[in-house]
Amino acid sequence: IWELKKDVYVVELDWYPDAPGEMVVLTCDTPEEDGITWTLDQSSEVLGSGKTLTIQVKEFGDAGQYTCHKGGEVLSHSLLLLHKKEDGIWSTDILKDQKEPKNKTFLRCEAKNYSGRFTCWWLTTISTDLTFSVKSSRGSSDPQGVTCGAATLSAERVRGDNKEYEYSVECQEDSACPAAEESLPIEVMVDAVHKLKYENYTSSFFIRDIIKPDPPKNLQLKPLKNSRQVEVSWEYPDTWSTPHSYFSLTFCVQVQGKSKREKKDRVFTDKTSATVICRKNASISVRAQDRYYSSSWSEWASVPCS
Amino acid sequence: RAVPGGSSPAWTQCQQLSQKLCTLAWSAHPLVGHMDLREEGDEETTNDVPHIQCGDGCDPQGLRDNSQFCLQRIHQGLIFYEKLLGSDIFTGEPSLLPDSPVGQLHASLLGLSQLLQPEGHHWETQQIPSLSPSQPWQRLLLRFKILRSLQAFVAVAARVFAHGAATLSP
């Protein structure tokens, strides 16, 4: 058993049939010594008396809010949550496995630049009685500070018969050094509580590996005289790190016909313009990627050829 | 070329070669995806790699003030990785794929380090980890780790030379 926060405790349980469970001793936070009784949740049934209560926690029915009273007055509360371990593996029932980039990916994170700011998100099908708490640091043995906000519900989607809820959180490294080569990964820890179930999820990454620039901005076409060719130009996204002579991007320009089956013409360039042939009913798209490190491409920015 | 006394390197040449190094480092080891290298206990060979850190003056302001600190750090790293790529970890069993660019990568690391430091001028270089051969089965994992680490190192070096070529070239 360990304390998650004031008056909230997590009991770690091996979850298999006929497991003996964990013996837990609760102590009433009071100077009083006698006349103390204990109840669980809203029930008025007295579970025991005395300054301490010893219970055997085996299942969710044994978890909940234990309250000690004296003469009708509440003295203190202890909320017991359960953390299940089945076959040596901690349960991951609350969050959905996003399976990208690999199985058992519950948290996904992205950064728009090298400033030390990043966003993480996760998915669940649970709509009520759900709380999240997020902590982060750079490195684990001698952690350096990363400040995370509160997790918020950022999207709701219908997937077949189920509703899926996306939560996200923004974090900022306290003393970020955008030009340095990271040697210690960022660690993100999410505590999830659904009713009386506790779970924790972690992710470890370098900012450089989660970079995904915003799409290029101000995408424009300029027809070239007496030619089917056009000059496409664009600019670095506002959110990208500066100066651009140091934090450089590379770009992919694609000409795509109306039909998805049509052959795509692609050009790669480090410049912020390119000359391409504009086919009728086609569209021109441009995306960006860090020039020197192969992290994710941005989403496409597109304009119609016409 | 960098010369004793701290005059400028051939920024444009260094830019071109460092960008080539980035391409080679990624073609030698595309994203592993299925292999999370951080889950595999860190071998000492990858613990001691020289990183370009915050105080090394490799940021745009530091380069403007005095690029020599940063160039020395990059040179140290190039020599370090050049030694590792020439070590038993890469030259031993199991065999690399026949068209592996590791040989080219090795040669390019040497080429860029020589651009930064001609013969006769010696910056202090970092101690190279023991090159005594690990057992063959451990090498694959070490190769992955070293190449991942090299990708991060050469990305910073390439940014430095690109910025230098754009803003510090005579």
Partner: antibody
Framework: EFQLVQSGAEVKKPGASVKVSCKAS????????MNWVRQAPGQSLEWMGV????????TYNQKFKGRVTITVDQSASTAYMELSSLRSEDTAVYYC???????WGQGTLVTVSS | DIVMTQTPLSLPVTPGEPASISCRSS???????????LNWFLQKPGQSPQLLIY???TRASGVPDRFSGSGSGTDLTLKISRVEAEDVGVYYC?????????FGSGTKLEIK
């Protein structure tokens, strides 16, 4: 094309030493370790040791207890295997094989006889 | 040292028939990178050994697809789906998981 060409057959007296060479061509010599393997008449193959041509670092089969020395001459793209204190049971064909064991020299017969 | 035990010692086969050679390792050659560090060679009379299979099951360049390698970390098998006259010679397994690299004692394949 890749080629490993070994020196010619040798006849040695017990107690003497022999030095076999293996000249590599068609690839970057320093990119690949060089192994040495021997085969006594009618017997299986026996790995003797390996050298990294970049640094000259070696790993030997302990069975040969300091009798074997593998070296390289980078400028000549050549690896050498020297075996000392020869005895009759060292009569064998000695092969060099590039890392990966896909490329082997043609073999050098060393006969130890009084 | 890892001991490689090869069976049978001799294998007479009729052309067109399949053949199977077994190799047992005293220690698993399967490591956490998912690879099994085992080679198979054929040595034809008067020639240097030629690599047939590496990493237990990958055919070397130019090797006909009638040759295949399989197995677990310790029990390895080389199969020839239809033996041809040119397949005669001595077959060896070799582990390259640990120094010193070791070979099996060899299996002599001959045509009946």
């Amino acid at each position: 094309e890749f080629q490993l060409v070994q020196s010619g057959a040798e006849v040695k007296k017990p107690g003497a030493s022999v030095k076999v060479s293996c000249k590599a061509s068609g690839y970057s010599f320093t990119d690949h370790n060089m192994n040495w393997v021997r085969q006594a008449p009618g017997q299986s193959l026996e790995w003797m040791g390996v050298i990294n041509p970049n640094y000259g670092t070696t790993t030997y089969n302990q069975k040969f207890k300091g009798r074997v020395t593998i070296t390289v001459d980078q400028s000549a793209s050549t690896a050498y295997m020297e075996l000392s204190s020869l005895r009759s049971e060292d009569t064998a064909v000695y092969y060099c094989a590039r890392r990966g064991f896909a490329y082997w020299g043609q073999g050098t017969l060393v006969t130890v006889s009084s | 040292d890892i001991v490689m035990t090869q069976t049978p010692l001799s294998l007479p086969v009729t052309p067109g028939e399949p053949a199977s050679i077994s190799c047992r390792s005293s220690k698993s050659l399967l490591y956490k990178d998912g690879k099994t560090y085992l080679n198979w060679f054929l040595q034809k009379p008067g020639q240097s050994p030629q690599l047939l299979i590496y990493l237990m099951s990958t055919r070397a360049s130019g090797v006909p697809d009638r040759f295949s390698g399989s197995g677990s970390g310790t029990d390895l098998t080389l199969k020839i789906s239809r033996v041809e006259a040119e397949d005669v010679g001595v077959y060896y397994c070799q582990q390259i998981a640990e120094y010193p690299f070791t070979f099996g004692s060899g299996t002599k394949l001959e045509i009946k």
